[in-house]
């Protein structure tokens, strides 16, 4: 009776279990009743990082110097290239696909610490009574306008992204 499931590092094809190709190799032909799975090593600048039945290896990541990237760790037949940014620059994501001089803090957040050559910008949420309505890499959260000191009243409450709106006091007749 043909198998319905195979062991680890095997795959089911044509009602039989074939060995997967090891990391660093791609599938050339499936096994048959009489032959083993045929695998071939990945070429230069290619890799496969799992036991697989892929017919094409993946291209190593290119660390584009025009984006400020450089190679941190050269890829092998089993691993992808790892990119990092030029000194003083920071990766925009864990995958490090591009670089920024420093990140900015979004509206609702202020800069707690300005970036240095080794550390990126540190942002903090604007607490009650403070706001930031811009993306910035240096501006702290600004305090809400004090309407009272201008002899005005709050017409619209402030948020972490907007200042309060002041207006004239209703005069009692």
């Amino acid at each position: 009776e043909p198998p319905t499931a195979c062991r680890e590092k095997q795959y089911l094809i044509n009602s039989q279990c074939c060995s997967l190709c090891q990391p660093g190799q791609k599938l050339v032909s499936d096994c048959t009743e009489f032959t083993e799975t045929e695998c071939l090593p990945c070429g230069e600048s290619e890799f496969l990082d799992t036991w697989n039945r892929e017919t094409h290896c993946h291209q190593h990541k290119y660390c584009d110097p025009n984006l400020g990237l450089r190679v941190q760790q050269k890829g092998t037949s089993e691993t992808d290239t790892i990119c990092t940014c030029e000194e003083g620059w920071h990766c925009t994501s864990e995958a490090c696909e591009s670089c920024v001089l420093h990140r900015s803090c979004s509206p609702g957040f202020g800069v707690k610490q300005i970036a240095t050559g080794v550390s990126d910008t540190i942002c903090e949420p604007c607490p009650v009574g403070f706001f930031s309505n811009v993306s910035s890499a240096f501006e702290k959260c600004h305090p809400w306008t004090s309407c009272e000191t201008k002899d005005l009243v709050v017409q619209q409450a402030g948020t972490n992204k907007t200042d309060v709106v002041c207006g004239p006091q209703d005069r009692l007749r």
Epitope: N66, L67, G68, E86, W89, T92, S98, C99, V100, L101, H102, R103, S104, V134, S135, S136, A137, F138, E139
Partner: nanobody
């Protein structure tokens, strides 16, 4: 395409002054926070000064506070850095940069050499 072209660098004696300019094109200059960043020979990047889009808020590194003044003219799409009381340690290539500070949004720089 974003272009940032710095100018105004040169050789100056200690105690002297220079005014750097950064001509911007390819984006709406008045909407962007702008920075001056410098790199001394063999050293890392140092964030020197920044200015918000309207020009009302500024930032200065401690090393230049009281000596450098950042400004902008949004009608001319130009960023400036007035540098007074220059010191040997101010020798560097000065770059202007725009938010979000990607590697592409980065000028080639202008060299400032402070030497007697």
């Amino acid at each position: 395409e974003v272009q940032l072209l710095e100018s105004g660098g040169g050789l100056v004696q200690p105690g002297g002054s220079l005014r750097l300019s950064c001509a911007a094109s390819g984006f709406t200059f008045r909407d962007y926070e702008m920075w001056w960043v410098r790199q001394a020979p063999g050293k890392g990047l140092e964030r020197v000064s920044a200015i918000n889009p309207a020009g009302g808020y500024t930032y200065y590194a401690d090393s230049v506070k009281g000596r450098f003044t950042i400004s902008r003219d949004n009608s001319k799409n130009t960023l400036y850095l007035q540098m007074n009381s220059l010191r040997a340690e101010d020798t560097a290539v000065y770059h202007c940069a725009k938010l979000p500070f990607t590697f592409e949004d980065w000028g080639q720089g202008t060299l400032v050499t402070v030497s007697s």
